[in-house]
């Protein structure tokens, strides 16, 4: 084993270097001392290290620790902040255009139907973005609520345009009508389904992302243990208190000691890889009727066609929310 | 049968769109996101390597230091003899993560349970029952575009494209800017312009 | 001139109920959706209700739910919240706030025009 | 919900300083982030909405920015009518929340 340099006889180079970590503090002893209160840089002859320098070099090792693990994941997290940021706006445009779309369908092919068309349909988009932002709203209530609220409109405006004024208090009767009678037929099971399936797999695409920046966040952020500060110490700056200023550490002695104070850290690994890939498997599937972007901008033509069924069947329907709904007042219907 | 809504702008307004050159679509852009992240996919049992590449290690020299001593670099004593005396690795091993950790593994195994829900072949199941109960729909085919709906001539096919670049749309809201309050009603030749995501590297 | 002014506010018992209302003027009352944020004596603020631009729609903070009733007349130009079941924790001056979109917004939740609020107290 | 962090609680500065406020998310709420500026017995005024967009009316001092989970709300030189509460509020997940305030008092 080659013998050691001999240790800097006035700590000259220790101080100076000591200085640049803590300016104006008189820690650093004139010339090498024994060190018998060092806990860390345990000494094997004199040394240039104080128990105050000690207590600094751990705090600042600690911190480059914390500053190497925030650039180590700074491409990861922009990686996911960026997307997630995209992809939540691009979600809105799309329900966005969609409402659009719906609101372009009405106007041009049942101009009597605005502007109550609008506010329904204005709605429903409204309850669409809030539950991708995670709120509880029922899907299928929403899907409800706007031909609950479209049907009596239709029956009044295109169906029975001539029904007086004082009729118009079958409103409840035909809300609870549209349900019972089918009068949309299967459309708001269709809408119900594909709706709810798009929606759903966009929400926990978010959530997903979201989640990830979270996991990147919290071991951005660790705090290191009092036993991995000792480790680092000894392992960055020990070498330092003996003079030895420019030597580095071993290579298989860093990737102990970085097992040992990212033991914790490294348990995270296989929910990660899980996480990527279950997120793959996800985003595999998001086509059809689970990409939003294809459901949400494809429903106008689904709620066209629904009221054209509507008008196919107006004869009937008439003639039977006719008998149904005369005595409204007596009779809530629902 | 139903106006394409492309062809929907208000009072027959021409619109002039710039030529898009290039159309990305959601699902292209989640594609690009997934193999990108799948390139951090041993970010975490990376880690303790990476930090000592980034960090000064003796790569060169023939000496190198290990806690407690200057010692050659491929000596035995270059991984082992600073570990002595201090305190048992292993128990700092044993340990266990930090509770932080703890918490965002269990957050990570309950997305992971949601993720794989959703990706669940047997999830798909309904998929087929969709066409077979009779929406008086046609057959729409198995290319790229998705059939939505459609009875008759009502029937439209839905590009899965969103522009991301010289999108322009009707809009029917009231689009007031924050804090401006006037009297404001919808404008029958409003069109609004959507803003470019731009491209994430 | 655009502004919204809230009453109804005073002292109630716990599990006593209170009506608060929010006249509007200014500007087209049934284009905005609209909501009720509370501020707890000293402390941040809490948005609480929020109701569309028709009326179709409801929303309600988990703290709120099934005890508050958010509604609106927008032929009078009025926003209402139905308190029921009052806990001493809803004391607060409760703001009515214009949601900065119209009705039916791809989630447009900041509050752009506010009124100056009305004290709700809610001790024995 | 998402707890929007802001920091520091109070900031004493004197008119003509720049004053620097922060707003950490707990988890990603993209720009979706609003600044709102409340003073004692006065209702909340919006200042700024999508992180950097100026509302209606408010002085070119005032200035937002960032993304992800950090913001800053900068008011570069403090004018007297400018000391007050400060607010953070996000829409980017629901419910809709606010931050616990920033004080900006008088040094």
């Known amino acids: 084993q080659p013998p050691p340099p001999p240790p800097d006889a006035t700590c000259h180079q220790v101080r100076s270097f000591f200085q640049r970590l803590q300016p104006g503090l008189k820690w650093v002893p004139e010339t090498p001392v024994p060190g018998s209160d060092l806990q860390v840089c345990l000494p094997k002859g004199p040394t240039c290290c104080s128990r105050k320098m000690e207590e600094k070099y751990q705090l600042t090792a600690r911190l480059n620790m914390e500053q190497l693990l925030q650039s180590a994941s700074m491409e990861l997290k922009f990686l996911i902040i960026q997307n997630a940021a995209v992809f939540q706006e691009a979600f809105e445009i799309v329900v966005r255009h969609a409402k659009n779309y719906t609101n372009a369908m009405f106007k041009n092919n049942y101009p009597s139907l605005t502007p109550q068309a609008f506010e329904f349909v204005g709605e429903f988009f409204t309850d669409v973005s809030l539950y991708i932002l995670g709120s509880d709203i029922n899907v299928d209530d929403m899907v409800n609520e706007l031909f609950d609220s479209l049907f009596p409109v239709i029956y009044t405006q295109l169906m029975n345009p001539g029904l007086p004024d004082s009729a118009l208090d079958i409103n409840e009767c035909l809300r609870g009508a549209r349900r019972d009678l089918k009068v949309f037929g299967n459309f708001p099971k269709l809408i119900m389904t594909q709706v709810s399936k798009s929606l759903q797999v966009t929400r926990i695409f978010l959530q997903a992302l979201n989640l990830g920046i979270e996991v990147i966040n919290t071991t951005d952020h660790l705090k290191f243990s009092k036993d991995c500060g000792r480790m680092l110490t000894r392992m960055w700056y020990c070498s330092y208190c003996q003079g030895l200023m420019m030597v580095k550490p071993c290579g298989g002695y860093c990737n102990v000691v970085m097992q040992g104070c990212m033991a914790g850290v490294v348990e995270i690994d296989k929910y990660w890889r899980e996480y990527i890939l279950s997120l793959e498997e996800l985003v595999n599937g998001m086509y059809r009727i689970y990409d939003m972007e294809n459901v949400l901008l494809g429903l106008f033509s689904t709620i066209h066609d629904s009221i054209q069924y509507v008008q196919k069947n107006a004869g009937k329907l008439t003639t039977t929310i006719g008998k149904l709904c005369a005595h409204s007042q007596q009779r809530q219907y629902r | 049968s139903a106006y394409y809504p492309e062809d929907l702008f208000i009072d027959k307004k021409v619109l002039k769109v710039a030529h898009v050159e290039h159309e990305e679509t959601l699902s292209s852009r989640r594609r690009e996101l997934i193999q990108k992240l799948k390139s951090f996919i041993s970010f975490y049992s990376a880690l303790p390597g990476y930090i000592c590449s980034h960090s000064p290690v003796a790569e060169n020299d023939t000496l190198c230091w290990n806690g407690q001593e200057l010692v050659e670099r491929y000596s035995q004593k270059a991984a082992r003899n600073g570990m002595k005396n201090q305190f048992n690795l292993h128990e700092l091993k044993m340990k266990g993560p930090e509770p932080v950790v703890s918490q965002i593994i269990d957050k990570l195994k309950h997305i992971n349970q949601l993720l794989r829900t959703m990706s669940m072949p047997k999830g798909r199941v309904l998929d087929k029952n969709l066409d077979e109960e009779g929406f008086e729909s046609g057959d729409c085919g198995d290319d790229e575009d998705e059939c939505i709906g459609g009875s008759g001539d009502g029937m439209i096919k839905v590009k899965n494209q969103l522009r991301f670049l010289a999108e322009l749309a009707y809009d029917l809201d009231v689009d007031d800017a924050p804090g401006n309050s006037q009297q404001a009603t919808p404008k029958d030749n409003e069109i609004s312009t959507f803003h470019n995501l731009g491209n994430v590297h | 001139e655009v502004q919204l002014v809230e009453s109804g506010g005073g002292l109630v018992q716990p599990g006593g109920s209170l009506r608060l209302s929010c006249a509007a003027s200014?500007?087209?009352?049934?284009?905005?959706?609209r909501s009720w944020v509370r501020q707890a004596p000293g402390k941040g603020l809490e948005w609480v209700s929020a109701?569309?631009?028709?009326?179709?729609?409801?929303y309600y903070a988990d703290s709120v739910k099934g005890r508050f009733t958010i509604s609106r007349d927008n032929s009078q130009n009025t926003l209402y919240l139905q308190m029921n079941s009052l806990r001493a924790e809803d004391t607060a001056v409760y703001y009515c706030?214009?949601?900065?979109?119209?009705?039916?917004?791809?989630?447009?939740?900041?509050?752009?025009?506010w009124g100056r609020g009305t004290l709700v107290t809610v001790s024995s | 919900e998402i707890v929007l962090t802001q920091s520091p609680a109070t900031l004493s500065l004197s008119p003509g300083e720049r004053a620097t406020l922060s707003c950490r998310a707990s988890?990603?709420?993209?720009?979706?982030l609003a600044w709102y500026q409340q003073k004692p017995g006065q209702a909340p005024r919006l200042l700024i909405y999508?992180?950097?967009n100026r509302a209606t009316g408010i002085p070119a001092r005032f200035s937002g920015s960032g993304s992800g989970t950090d913001f800053t709300l900068t008011i570069s030189s403090l004018e007297p009518e400018d000391f007050a509460v400060y607010y953070c509020?996000?829409?980017?997940?629901?419910?809709?929340?606010f931050g616990q305030g920033t004080k900006v008092e008088i040094k």
């Open positions: 200014g500007f087209t009352f049934s284009s905005y959706a």
């Open positions: 988890q990603s709420v993209s720009s979706y």
């Open positions: 509020q996000q829409r980017s997940n629901w419910p809709p929340t």
């Open positions: 706030a214009k949601n900065y979109y119209g009705s039916g917004s791809a989630s447009y939740w900041y509050f752009d025009l």
């Open positions: 109701i569309s631009g028709g009326g179709g729609r409801t």
């Open positions: 999508d992180a950097s």
